[in-house]
Each structure stands twice: as C-alpha cells, then as structure tokens.
C-alpha cells in the first residue's frame, strides 16, 4: 500500500527564526527516514544533533528529532525528511521539506562575497541564477552591474526569489561582468559580488588512463578511467558505450577536479566486475559540451588463462659497437598477465653484474657499451602465480673500431728524424673487432714548401698505397704482418722496413674493419744533420782573421733560422741580432745559414748562437758556440833543433815545434835551400816534422826551420852527420 508522506513538526513551506535561537524540527513517518540538510548544517558536528525514536500509537511510527543549537544565518536553507530505500519513481511522494530562514540583521545574505566576487558560469540563452539568497524573505535586494546598470526584476525575464536569488530566464552578453546584490538593513548597506564568465564548449583533451589495449583474465574486474580536460568555463556530459551495454553491466562514477587554476578535469570511472568473454571489445568514452564532442576508445581483451610466447626480434646473433651510448637488446614477447622479467648475461643476473644494465619492459638496455658486454643474453619470463615460465637466449657481438697502439702510447710532441741512408723499421699495432687489416701509404713532402710543415702543406697531394715492390718514395725492404699479444689482447702488428732512407714524407698506416678506420701518420723526415741541428766553426780565429760559422738545421723540423750574439749585462743574458747575415741555403734535407765576420778583433769574442723555431712545438731552440778571439803573438820554438848523427840507409826525424798566434807556418831549409816534399822526404802535420827515409851521404848538411806568422818569425838550425859508406850499385 502507498506510504503516507513523512510529516514535519513545522507546518507550511517556510519558517522564519532569529539567528542565535535553537531550531527544533521533528519528522514523523511510517518508515525509517533520513534528513537532507543545507551544506553548512551538514558540516556542523557540535551544534547539530539528531535523535531517533519509536513514536505514535503502539510505537509503530518512526520519529527523528533534529536540534540545531545557536542557529546561524548561513544555516538558512531546505530541511527535508525522506524515507530510506524507496524506488526513485516514488521519490516525490515520500519526502517532506521546509525552507527555514535564519534571520540576522547583521548578515542579510546567506553567502557573502564582499571582497572577491564569486564566479558564476553562464551560457547565453540559458537560465542564469545570481545566487544572492537572503536570510529573511522580507529583505529588499537590488541587483547592479558595474559600472552603472541596475537590473530590475520584471517578473518575467528577471525574477527575484528570496530562496535562490535573482533568476534571469535567458541570459545575454549584457549579464557578463561584475554584478552586485545590495541590501540595506537598519540603514547599513550590504553588498555581495558575483562575476559572470561565459561558459565555453571547448574540450581540450579526452584520455582513457589505462594501457591500450586492456588485457584481463576472465573473472577479473575491469576499471577504466576517462579524463576530460576543459577550460574553467566549460561543463561536460560524459557517457560510455561498451559491448554488453544493454545488460547495464557497468557501474559509472563521476567527479570533477577544480583545483587547477587553468583547467577543469572531469573524471568518469567505468567498472565491470567478473569480466566474461561477452565483455571483450571496444569501450568508448564520449564527452560532449554543447555542440562540441570528443571521444576516445580502447580495446578490451579477455584471456582464459595465463600465457607467454617469446621470439627473437631480429636474428639470434646481434651486433653492436663499443662506445655506443645505449644499446637495446629486446625480444618479441606476448604474454598475459605481465610476466616477471629477468635478464641473464652468460648465466648470471645482468643487472647485478653491472649498473650499466637496465631492464625496461622486455628489453635490456646496455649503457655505454664496452667490449666486455659481448656474450650470451637470456631473457627469463615467469608468471609465478600461474606457473608459466619461458626463456630465450641471444648472442651479442660487440664490434670495436680499430685502435692503433702506438698512437696511444706516443708522447713525442714532434716527429723523429731519420739519418740519411739509414735502414728504418716502422711498426703499427692495431686492435679491433673484427680483426682489422692494416695498409701502408706514402705521402711525399712538397719540397717547394721549405718553411712549412710537410703534413700541413701537402694536403692536396696524393697518397700512394705501398707494398714490398713499391718504387714510391724510399726503397722498401719488406712489409710484414704478425699477431702479437699486448695487454692480454690479440693485436695485429704490421712492420714496414725502409731499406735506404733518402726521401722525406709521411708514412701512413691505416687500420680498417667494418666498424671504421683509423690512421697513424709517421712523419718520416730525413736528416743529413746530426740531431737535426748542428753548428760548425771552421777554426777559432785570431785577431784580424775571418770568423766563419755555419748552422745547419733539418728543414722539415725547423724554420726562422738566425744567428744571434749572447752578452751578459748585469747578470742578465741579452740577445743581440747580428746584421748582414747571408740568405739561408735550402738543400734537399736541410737549411744552412752561414755567418762570416771579416777581420775580427778581440771585441768579437763571445757566445754565438744559432736560433731556430721548432715547426711543431713553436719552441725556440738555441745551439751555442763560445768564440774566443786570440791576440796575435810572435812565433817561439818549444825546442831548438840539435846536431845529430845518423847511420846511412836508416831514417831520421827532425822536429820543429813552434807556438804563436796565429799558428805559425813552418818552412824547412837545407844548406839554405828550401826543402820541398819529395820521395824519401816527408813533411809531417803542419810541416812541424821532417822525416827522411833511407838517409844517403847527400842528406848530410845544415838543416834549419823557420816558424813565421803575421807577428814575426823564429829560426833554429842543426847539423846532420851521415855515418858509413854507401853502396852506389845498390842504389842503382
């Protein structure tokens, strides 16, 4: 039978009471019921109490008494009592409500927005409510729009309702702006502000925040979350369509997040319990705002049981290159539910082996690939709860770009020099995966560029590939290759033997494999000068003679050759340039700069230095020669000649040692006749000794020597006696 409406203790549709009083309101009904209260009352915990009791004849009725102590203006609103668990179609018949005004002379408006206006969204042509409801129905309220408009209720388009505020039946652009409700109570003006924003129909984005496609095991619960993002002024309707929609399988929850200052986020969450095969298919979330529409869908797959299939993505043997920032080793996996993934390297857990190994989904990422990363990689896949396990192994080869060992260990800032005509052994040791091949090339120096680096100036010139029979450049004795173990690695050593070093240039060894190519330039500069830099003094000059110095440098290693004089002044060495230097002479392998100072005096003594700049390092190199000009001194004999006797046919030596500056010239006389060198008479070094072989009677006589230089001369004489007779026939 039809239930009689619940009955409230206060009769009529509305009731006015003063703020600060206590509100007592009883609801009596034929079934259990609940209260629906204004928002601010529901939040009250201490002021509000609800007491339930049995009442009426025989206690057969249900009573509920609501008590609100010290009621306040913002408690104004609808208080309703309704039966529990009544079909929604009969809702109207099973609810009783009353609107209670809680009057406060100091607070005419229920909601006061005296400083910052409350934003109201409006759509042109639709109803717009300016919700400045009041705490007493007798309060007169005026609606104003900044700057000067007053919106007057006409009972049609604009209606005043003390329970709601101003109702504008079809809003226009004229209502967009800053609106103020004003009320004067006891001579005091009260204002509450509202700002209308035009409602838009923009949908920024719609997403289903679950992986696509969605996979589920039969009997499990499906939860799909649809999110719509809109500007602040947009409201949306969200609906779902799905395979078993006719049976209303899904429950949908909605909520809105307005915490973001730039956008509204609307959520619609679809849930289906105990998924069956009939629930698989396309699930679509549709979002509408006025004429705007957006939708997003996802496929839902249902599986009867857990499974794993795994295959190689490409081939079983994979290749990468050492030095790569990142390499992804991945397998083609189909599985449900998601299996646990463990990667092994050579049988051991990869991620424990190195921090450079990271698991991402079904892939193993190797960061900063090195040669040591080569090996066998196994993916272990397991769905433990279903006892499903699979594994698959792939082999990774890490290729290495060739490296030339000598290039790494070489610390020479500038090239080595190779003595002219020498035999030289040049070696390049290369490492790489796969094993690199080594080829030799010859790059001749351009001899026109006498003052430039060979490896700079010859860019445009061709390089020639070499073999043992090549006739380019220097004669090659052999080119050989052998394997060498260096630092525990198998390296390829290639040796080029130059038989006869004659031509300057650059030998280039190139090591190549499929990863790349690397080259080493060996500057092969021939030198005809020891160490590539040599200073020569013809002889130490005496006062009045010429000083002759020469400086020879390797032309590929040095430039800017000049002679300077070093003088020490106040403990500081000063460099003085020497004027009137001759032009340098450039030859095939070297540059020579001669310095001649004519007719030297004692003041020309000092440290002479040849200065040249190293082409490679830019460093200035000095080679010094200490020159001491000697004062002239008349000759003097260290020992006078003395008479002596010699046997016929024997030999004899006469010594005439003299000193003087410059070194004296020695002249020999016999019986006042100048002696010339002839068979049997030999003049020793500097003519200071006279050697007579097989003495004869004719050799007897007076011998004298004369030592002469620019300062004078000195003489000494002696008589040579020959003893015994000669056998003339023998001499014939």
């Amino acid at each position: 039978s039809k239930l009689k409406d619940p009955e409230l203790s206060l009769k009529g549709t509305q009731h006015i009471m003063q703020a600060g009083q206590t509100l007592h309101l009883q609801c009596r009904g034929e079934a259990a019921h609940k209260w629906s209260l204004p928002e601010m009352v529901s939040k009250e915990s201490e002021r509000l109490s609800i007491t339930k009791s049995a009442c009426g004849r025989n206690g057969k009725q249900f009573c509920s008494t609501l008590t609100l102590n010290t009621a306040q203006a913002n408690h104004t609103g609808f208080y309703s009592c309704k039966y529990l668990a009544v079909p929604t179609s009969k809702k109207k018949e099973t609810e009783s409500a009353i609107y209670i005004f809680i009057s406060d002379t100091g607070r005419p408006f229920v909601e006061m927005y005296s400083e910052i206006p409350e934003i109201i969204h409006m759509t042109e042509g639709r109803e717009l409510v300016i919700p400045c409801r009041v705490t007493s129905p007798n309060i007169t309220v005026t609606l104003k729009k900044f700057p000067l408009d007053t919106l007057i209720p006409d009972g049609k388009r604009i209606i005043w309702d003390s329970r709601k505020g101003f109702i504008i039946s079809n809003a226009t652009y004229k209502e967009i702006g800053l609106l103020t409700c004003e009320a004067t109570v006891n001579g005091h003006l009260y204002k509450t502000n509202y700002l209308t924003h035009r409602q838009t129909n923009t949908i920024i984005d719609v997403q289903i925040s679950t992986p696509r496609p969605v996979k589920l095991l039969r009997g499990h619960t499906l939860v799909l979350n649809c999110t719509a993002t809109t500007p602040l002024n947009t409201r949306v309707q969200m609906t779902w369509s799905y395979p078993d929609e006719k049976n209303k399988r899904a429950s949908v929850r909605r909520r809105i997040d307005q915490s973001n200052s730039h956008a509204n986020i609307f959520y619609s969450v679809l849930t289906i319990d105990k998924m069956q095969n009939k629930d698989k298919g396309l699930y679509t979330c549709r979002v509408r705002s006025g004429p705007s529409f957006k939708s997003v869908n996802t496929s839902v797959h249902i599986y009867d049981k857990a499974f794993i299939t795994v295959k190689h993505r490409k081939q079983q043997v994979l290749e990468t290159v050492a030095g790569k920032r990142s390499y992804r080793l991945s397998m083609k996996v189909k599985a449900f539910p998601s299996p646990e993934v463990v990667w092994l390297k050579d049988g051991l857990p990869a991620t424990e082996k190195s921090a450079r190994y990271l698991t991402r989904g079904y892939s193993l990422i190797i960061k900063d690939v090195t040669e040591e990363d080569a090996g066998n990689y196994t993916i272990l896949l397991s769905i433990k709860q279903s006892n499903v396990f699979k594994n698959l192994t792939a082999t990774l080869i890490v290729n290495v770009k060739p490296q030339i060992y000598e290039k790494a260990v070489s610390s020479f800032p500038d090239p080595a020099l190779y003595p002219l005509g020498s035999r030289q052994i040049l070696t390049c040791t290369a490492y790489g995966i796969p094993q690199p091949t080594i080829k030799w090339f010859w790059h001749p120096c351009n001899h026109n560029h006498s003052e430039a680096r060979c490896d700079f100036c010859s860019n445009n010139e061709e390089s020639f590939i070499l073999d043992a029979d090549s006739n380019m450049g220097n004669r090659i004795e052999s080119i050989t290759q052998r394997m060498a173990i260096i630092e525990g690695k198998n390296k390829m050593a290639s040796t080029l033997v130059v038989a006869d070093s004659r031509i300057s240039g650059i030998y280039i060894c190139i090591a190549s494999n499929k990863v790349g190519t690397v080259g080493r330039n060996i500057s092969f500069y021939i030198t005809d000068v020891p160490n590539g830099f040599h200073v020569n003094l013809e002889k130490m000059p005496t006062e009045g003679e010429d000083l002759k110095l020469s400086c020879t440098v390797n032309k590929f290693l040095y430039r800017d050759v000049t002679w300077i004089l070093l003088r020490t002044v106040n403990n500081r060495t000063m460099h003085y340039s020497i004027s009137k230097q001759k032009m340098a002479i450039t030859k095939e392998h070297s540059i020579t700069l001669n310095l001649t100072i004519m007719n030297v005096s004692l003041q020309d003594s000092g440290t002479y230095a040849c200065r040249a700049r190293n082409v490679y390092t830019g460093e200035e190199i000095l080679q010094k020669k200490e020159i001491t000009i000697r004062d002239q001194e008349a000759p003097y004999l260290l020992r006078n000649l003395s008479d002596h006797t010699v046997a016929i046919s024997s030999s004899t030596t006469l010594d005439c040692h003299a000193n003087g500056v410059p070194e004296p010239q020695i002249t020999w006389f016999k019986n006042n006749h100048k002696i010339q060198q002839e068979p049997g008479i030999i003049l020793g070094p500097g003519s200071s000794t006279l050697f007579i072989e097989r003495v004869t009677e004719e050799d007897e006589g007076v011998y004298h020597c004369k030592a002469t230089n620019q300062k004078g001369s000195v003489e000494s004489s002696a008589y040579l006696t020959v003893q015994g007779t000669s056998d003339k026939s023998n001499l014939e």
Epitope: E115, I116, L178, K191
Partner: nanobody, 119 residues
C-alpha cells in the same frame, strides 16, 4: 589626501606584455580590496581584475582570464597588473580603484594610464 597614481602604460605590439603599477597613499591600502578598471575609446567602463586586501585571492573578468594577473605589495602600497598576450581589443585607459566593485567616489580612483596595442 587620497592618491592613486598609475604607471607602466605604453604602446605594445599584439602578443606583447606590459606591467602596470598603481602607487597608493592617503588611506590604509592593506585594508581594502582593489580593482583594475578600463575604458576603451567610445565604450563604457569595464571591470578587469580584482584582488583581496591580503593579496592571496584574485579574480579576472572573462575577457582577460588567463592573460592578466593582478598582484599587490602591501609593504610598498602598490597594486600591479601584469598583462601578457595583449590583443588590440585591450587598448584602453586603465584605472586602479579602491574596492570591488570600485567605489563610486572618484577620489579613490587614479587618473589612468593609456595602453595601446597595435602593430
């Protein structure tokens, strides 16, 4: 004597930015909500932005939402309006005024600063 002095207006290209300032004196600035109001040539006054006395709550008219930001520095008695992504229709004389909505007493309004948005 109450004084509100606006500054910072000028000529700017569409898409550009300007920052208006309003220096207040002669009343307890920190006790009042403040407004920015504008008047385009030949049009009526339009309320643009407002900020509460503490400076922690702001609100903008629909026409400038997301582009203009109102702020205040109570220690300096100054109100600001940061205007970004300016459009030709933002061309107007901009006033700062006491309260929301602005008081009818024009003594509590500034003299205005001109903003022109044009290429």
């Amino acid at each position: 004597e109450v004084q509100l002095v606006e500054s910072g207006g000028g000529l700017v290209q569409p898409g550009g930015s300007l920052r208006l300032s309003c220096a207040a004196s002669g009343f307890t600035f920190s006790s009042y909500a403040m407004s920015w109001v504008r008047q385009a040539p030949g049009k009526e006054l339009e309320w643009v932005s407002g900020i509460n006395s503490g400076g922690d709550r702001t609100v903008n008219a629909d026409s400038v939402k997301g582009r203009f930001t109102v702020s205040r520095d109570n220690a300096k008695n100054t109100l600001y309006l940061q205007m970004n992504s300016l459009k030709p229709e933002d061309t107007a004389l901009y006033y700062c005024a006491k309260s929301i909505p602005p008081t009818d007493d024009r003594n509590y309004w500034g003299q205005g600063t001109q903003v022109t948005v044009s290429s």
